[in-house]
């Protein structure tokens, strides 16, 4: 009797178990009692990434330079194009449909992780003993100057935004 369920990489149509088309190919015609499923390769600008019964291939993603995008990996008949962002920009989402400039870390904050094409700058507050006095997308928190190693004393305490100010030791007369 006609099947009610089919094996992996098959689909049920008109009481027939038909083979799915392999990745990189689209369905031209379903199988019949007497013929196989017929599939055709996707064209150069298209892809299908699964075993399928799609009658149309998907268009490769376009990495629009007007949105700051560039090609990270060219698409094949089985994979989509992967976009990334130009230098100084990162993706706004996981699908990377547009780009925005990297965030700078404000004074009092340093760069914990430098931005990539797909992730923004990660900032962290400068802990005690460290400072950042610039707005930067690259600079980490810097340690306060060690006055002692210079045979000097702290004249003005450092903050998370400023370095300590060192001065000469008071000489007893």
């Amino acid at each position: 009797e006609p099947p009610t369920a089919c094996r992996e990489k098959q689909y049920l149509i008109n009481s027939q178990c038909c083979s799915l088309c392999q990745p990189g190919q689209k369905l031209v015609s379903d199988c019949t009692e007497f013929t196989e499923t017929e599939c055709l390769p996707c064209s150069e600008s298209e892809f299908l990434d699964t075993w399928n019964r799609e009658t149309r291939c998907h268009q490769h993603k376009y990495c629009d330079p007007n949105l700051g995008l560039q090609v990270q990996q060219k698409g094949t008949s089985e994979t989509d194009t992967i976009c990334t962002c130009e230098e100084g920009l990162h993706c706004t989402s996981e699908s990377c449909e547009s780009c925005v400039p990297h965030r700078s870390c404000l004074p009092g904050f340093g760069v914990k992780q430098i931005a990539t094409g797909v992730s923004d700058t990660i900032c962290e507050p400068c802990p005690v003993g460290f400072f950042s006095n610039v707005s930067s997308a690259f600079e980490k928190c810097r340690p306060w100057t060690s006055c002692e190693t210079k045979d000097l004393v702290v004249q003005q305490a450092g903050t998370n935004k400023t370095d300590v100010v060192c001065g000469p030791q008071d000489r007893q007369r």
Epitope: S19, V28, S29, D30, T32, E33, F34, T35, E36
Partner: antibody, heavy 112, light 112 residues
């Protein structure tokens, strides 16, 4: 239900061209399936002659030595057989078939 | 071309008794997807062939369950579990895996 009906002359002279038409109802010949011509000489077995596919492409039996042509008229949902340079050996019942559904057959006699 | 050889060429069976027809192909009918396109037909006297079994073992719609098909590769069998008077005629196997499609020479079933 799918139905196929052959039509054409029952008598053809030797060396002339045999022409038959198959009219299909209940299914579009451009949807799917292969549309076949099969013949059966008197008192003998079945011989596959060729097919035209849903997309218009063909395959023929090499034993017929390039004498056979199968074409279609999609506007009438018909497909046709032409067999050139016929001889008495081409006398047979000619069937059109989708392989699950067959026409009732038409007898063609080759004789002068 | 693939040669299809049927045995026996004729058989006479008492109603209610089983019958078996063998069909052997000169090369494997299994394609690269692992599917085998082998059909069985019955041609009753004065009629067109009617499909009984497709893809080796699938009964066509409306075919009684006393008909069954089996086999793989090059060896195929049609079985009738209990022959009835209406089963008389000529049985043909047909391979449609490879072009040209080829029929067996036929097996004539008679009732004792």
């Amino acid at each position: 239900e799918v139905q196929l009906q052959e039509s054409g002359p029952g008598l053809v002279k030797p060396s002339e061209t045999l022409s038959l038409t198959c009219t299909v109802s209940g299914y579009s010949i451009t949807s799917n399936y292969y549309w076949n011509w099969i013949r059966q000489p008197p008192g003998k077995g079945l011989e596959w002659m060729g097919y035209i596919r849903y997309d218009g492409s063909n395959n023929y039996n090499p034993s017929l030595k390039n004498r056979v042509t199968i074409s279609r008229d999609t506007s009438k949902n018909q497909f046709s057989l032409k067999l050139s340079s016929v001889t008495a050996a081409d006398t047979a019942v000619y069937y059109c078939a989708r392989l699950d559904y067959w026409g009732q057959g038409t007898t063609v006699t080759v004789s002068s | 071309d693939i040669v299809m050889t049927q045995t026996p060429l004729s058989l006479s069976v008492t109603p209610g008794q089983p019958a078996s027809i063998s069909c052997r192909s000169s090369q494997s009918l299994e394609n690269t997807n692992g599917n085998t396109f082998l059909n069985w037909y019955l041609q009753k006297p004065g009629q067109s062939p009617q499909l009984l079994i497709y893809r080796v073992s699938n009964r066509f719609s409306g075919v009684p369950d006393r008909f069954s098909g089996s086999g793989s590769g090059t060896d195929f069998t049609l079985k009738i579990s209990r022959v009835e008077a209406e089963d008389v005629g000529v049985y043909y196997c047909l391979q449609v895996t490879h072009v040209p499609f080829t029929f067996g020479q036929g097996t004539k079933l008679e009732i004792k």
